[in-house]
Amino acid sequence: APVLPGEDSKDVAAPHSQPLTSSERIDKHIRYILDGISALRKETCNRSNMCESSKEALAENNLNLPKMAEKDGCFQSGFNEDTCLVKIITGLLEFEVYLEYLQNRFESSEEQARAVQMSTKVLIQFLQKKAKNLDAITTPEPTTNASLLTKLQAQNQWLQDMTTHLILRSFKEFLQSSLRALRQM
């Protein structure tokens, strides 16, 4: 099974002397998830032509994937560390239902999909410890998530493939933006 960052003593300098919320730990964790996403994207692109498809907009209309916007304060222009940290945590919480959807979408990378899901949960915990302004963080309603999951799983094969591709692409972009922003916190 994939090793989570910090489980392997070679992976992190002085593993026991670092708080879980340290910049390096969080950075490593995000990079670990990004590596997992790359592996999943590889399988998705190999088994379908979704990665070259120009029909993404059709499927995107059905999805409400978290996305960084100027108002979230996570870009260089208008950077706001408190607002941004809340957005990162909220966005990750919103991605959880989509990561759950991905669990049955992979054959050879089934373990990798599980690792991405589990390490995202751990990342959320790390970031919640780091966040001071926890009141502003809204958790998605379980019932809303359940109905969204049912709706996604009921799509035809082409839409399911496209949805998988879009989730992975959006999650990658969200994490890359988070990585850049967290560097200045």
Epitope: S9, K10, D11, A14, S22, S23, E24, Q184
Partner: antibody
Framework: EVQLLESGGGLVQPGGSLRLSCAAS????????MSWVRQAPGKGPEWVSR????????YYGDSVKGRFTISRDNSKNTLYLQMNSLRAEDTAVYYC?????WGSGDYWGQGTLVTVSS | QTVVTQEPSFSVSPGGTVTLTCGLS?????????PGWYQQTPGQAPRALIY???DRHSGVPDRFSGSISGNKAALTITGAQAEDEADYYC?????????FGGGTQLTVL
Amino acid sequence: EVQLLESGGGLVQPGGSLRLSCAASGFTFSSYAMSWVRQAPGKGPEWVSRISAGGGSTYYGDSVKGRFTISRDNSKNTLYLQMNSLRAEDTAVYYCANRAGWGSGDYWGQGTLVTVSS
Amino acid sequence: QTVVTQEPSFSVSPGGTVTLTCGLSSGSVTASNYPGWYQQTPGQAPRALIYSTNDRHSGVPDRFSGSISGNKAALTITGAQAEDEADYYCALDIGDITEFGGGTQLTVL
């Protein structure tokens, strides 16, 4: 053009205090974490402290923890280092630097000399 | 306390290639340590050469390149010139702090 200009250095007695300032220009100061790095005569650089872009988080090297305080005023584009209980080993050139990120590297000022001696 | 290690000294012939390394006393250097490289000549402030492992600072000649090789960060100078004779320091983010190496004194013979 990025410019960082340190000031406030000078000669101070052991146990004394000093406040360093760093005036920043040429970049979006409030979007960058900022650091103080020092270099004792004939030695290599030593990281002293860092403050997050919004000022909400501060970090310190073991040698200055509890004695030095980093702060910033984003409305004035200025970084500060309050140094208390100064020791002879704090004698160094103090540089301020922005944290690499947003696609650009870190820039350093020319430094201000702090001498702790009786 | 994790120590950042560098070769104390190195020499290279003009036009030659040299690789300086930056390691950790415990563990491997990764991209999450954001390796940075600095050049310092006598009487001058350190000058940033490389940040975030392999990004070249603006105005730095392309003979300077950064990488992670094995478990260390590396600075390679390809086609060394006389003006490259200087002290080179690496810096790593470790946990929430930054640690500098002891430096490598590079001589261009």
